[in-house]
């Protein structure tokens, strides 16, 4: 057993060396090790074949080190590996696309808070058993086509806290088992109408705290299992273009956050879901310093590059935004209940989804909403105090959205046998 480590055999052969100031992967790790804990050290490099002798390894924790480089063959030979935690290594920045090849049994991969700027082609190729993929709190700007194509068993995909600006058509191809998709606190301004085509089992979708001014309902149509949808803290434009989304929300039987309008000014701060159909008239066009809300090509039907309902003959002139008029709604998120809609009583009693932190983000002053968040500014974040996890009603398989724990306090019955959060 390496000097800084503790090794024991029951209930699993374990080599445990956390927070020992190690600067390199120690030599002499017992070949029979099933679990290796190397978290909280000063390891900066994982060389090729570092664990090759450990053929029985199922759990490897390398989180909270100072990893700057992982050789492409670092995890060669680990055919039985199930959990790999590389999180909290902010200097890592990039991972060779071959790094995880051969890890056919891997079911949990933590790559959160690794400073990742891109996902190289084929990075997740062959990870057919993967169920939990943690990519939150990185610096990802794009979701390349087919990045997750091989992940047919993935149930949880955490992408929040990145810099993703759009969701292209093929970003989530192949994710037929996905249950939970967290895309909040990014810079998403556009979602392709077919982006969620394969997500027929998705139950939870978080898109709050992005740059969405509109969302094509065609994108939502494939989400037959959706139960939890959070769209707050986006610069929603509540004019004629929002009618399809409004109609979809009226029919949606799941739980959804508020969808506070940013434009037009007269509706700023109001919840799209609570508006009447005839409130959604005309066309709020932001010009001057603001990007156009709609950026489609001009066609015969849309000769001005605007949706049909926004063409001059269809527009309600009174609601068209004058050039240069601010697109800010001030703090359009703060009131969980629109003025005049306050329920009776003193606010006590059960809380519902609009009272959650996804209605108003904790710990941060809320900047005025603008049509597009300025380049370089970060989306408002949750406190970074630490990392969070359903069919078995297991809190850590915690999408648990479908399972009602509480016939008051029944306590759930999950076994927690798979990584979650």
């Amino acid at each position: 057993c390496p000097g800084a480590c503790v090794c024991y055999n029951e209930p699993k052969v374990t080599t445990s060396c956390p927070q020992q100031g190690l600067q390199a992967v120690p030599v002499g790790i017992p070949a029979a090790s099933q679990r290796i804990f190397l978290h909280g050290n000063r390891i900066s490099h994982v060389p090729a074949a570092s664990f090759r002798a450990c053929r029985n390894l199922t759990i490897l924790w390398l989180h909270s080190n100072v990893l700057a480089r992982i050789d492409a063959a670092a995890f060669t030979g680990l055919a039985l590996l199930e959990q790999l935690d590389l999180s909290d290594n902010a200097q890592l920045r990039s991972v060779d696309p071959a790094t995880f090849h051969g890890l056919g049994r891997l079911h949990t991969l933590h790559l959160d808070r690794c400073g990742l700027q891109e996902l190289g082609p084929g990075l997740f190729r062959g990870l057919a058993a993967l169920q939990y993929l943690y990519l939150q709190d990185n610096a990802l700007q794009a979701l390349p086509d087919d990045t997750f194509r091989d992940l047919g068993n993935l149930t949880h995909l955490f992408l929040h806290g990145n810099r993703i600006s759009s969701v292209p058509e093929r970003a989530f191809r192949g994710l037929h088992s996905l249950d939970r998709l967290l895309l909040h606190q990014n810079r998403v301004a556009h979602v392709h109408p077919h982006a969620f085509r394969d997500l027929g089992r998705l139950m939870t979708l978080y898109l709050f705290a992005n740059n969405l001014s509109a969302l094509p309902t065609e994108a939502l149509a494939p989400l037959r299992a959706l139960q939890y949808l959070r769209l707050n803290d986006n610069p929603w434009v509540c004019d004629c273009r929002a009618r399809p989304l409004w109609a979809w929300l009226q029919k949606f039987r799941g739980s959804s956050s508020e969808v506070p309008c940013s434009l037009p000014q007269r509706l700023a701060g109001r919840d799209l879901k609570r508006l009447a159909a005839n409130d959604l008239q005309g066309c709020a066009v932001a010009t001057g310093p603001y990007h156009p809300i709609w950026t489609g090509r001009a066609t015969d039907e849309e000769p001005l590059g605007l949706p049909k309902c926004c063409q001059p003959d269809a527009a309600d002139k009174a609601s068209v935004l004058e050039p240069g008029r601010p697109a800010s709604a001030g703090n359009a998120l703060k009131g969980r209940v629109p003025p005049g809609d306050s329920p009776p009583g003193n606010g006590s009693g059960p809380r519902h989804i609009n009272d959650s932190p996804f209605g108003t983000l904790p710990g941060s002053a809320e900047p005025p909403l603008t049509a597009v968040r300025p380049e370089g500014s970060e989306p408002p974040g949750f406190p970074t105090s630490g990392p969070r996890r359903r069919p078995g009603c297991s809190r850590k398989n915690r999408t648990r959205s479908h399972c009602r724990l509480g016939q008051a306090g029944s306590g759930g019955g999950g076994t927690g046998d798979s990584e979650g959060s």
């Epitope: 909040h184 105090s385 990392p387 969070r388 850590k396 999408t399 759930g412």
Partner: antibody, heavy 125, light 107 residues
Framework: QMQLVQSGAEVKKPGASVKVSCKVS????????IHWVRQAPGKGLEWMGG????????VYAQKFQGRVTLTDDTSTDTAYMELSSLRSEDTAVYYC??????????????????WGRGTMITVSS | DIQMTQSPSSVSASVGDRVTITCRAS??????LAWYQQKPGKAPKLLIY???RLQSGVPLRFSGSGSGTDFTLTINSLQPEDSATYYC?????????FGQGTRLEIK
Amino acid sequence: QMQLVQSGAEVKKPGASVKVSCKVSGYTLSELSIHWVRQAPGKGLEWMGGFDPEDDETVYAQKFQGRVTLTDDTSTDTAYMELSSLRSEDTAVYYCARDLGYLTSGNYYDAFDIWGRGTMITVSS
Amino acid sequence: DIQMTQSPSSVSASVGDRVTITCRASQDINRWLAWYQQKPGKAPKLLIYAASRLQSGVPLRFSGSGSGTDFTLTINSLQPEDSATYYCQQTNNFPRTFGQGTRLEIK
């Protein structure tokens, strides 16, 4: 700096009820998941219940089912724990605590990272 | 409910020693375990969550590891202020359950 400030100690008679308050400062209550834990003199910690944001409901330990009620007043950012039909074995310090995991919205590593100072409830005839 | 069993129930060690406390869950809880320190008359303080994540402000001499059903809290180079009772808690599902506690005394 977030704090949880609890109400003061109380002495109650068996069969009575008690309502302990937990005032949030530094956050708004609606941003948090608050749980309640008690500790009898010289004994260990016992989870009573808390708000489960995932299912948007309050969940309780079976042991306290029907006797404990957890409520929130979001207008004053105060959480309450009411325990009825008190008996001598309910003599304990009652703590409110914040769930860390709720703040990280997708990382799910739940734990109670901020605690109130505790409220001593003595049940004695 | 998931039962959490700590061992030993009490331990006495000297300043500078390395102390290990173990916690066993009655069923697989993956890595969803927290450790707390409690001093007399005070509220518990979170040390570690998710089995191995050190809470902000906690000294580096504290470390946690384990997964499945067996977990350890290790205190390297014991300090006088580490005298306290230590509790594990499973955070895998409801009801949350705690271990019975381990009392650590400095010789």
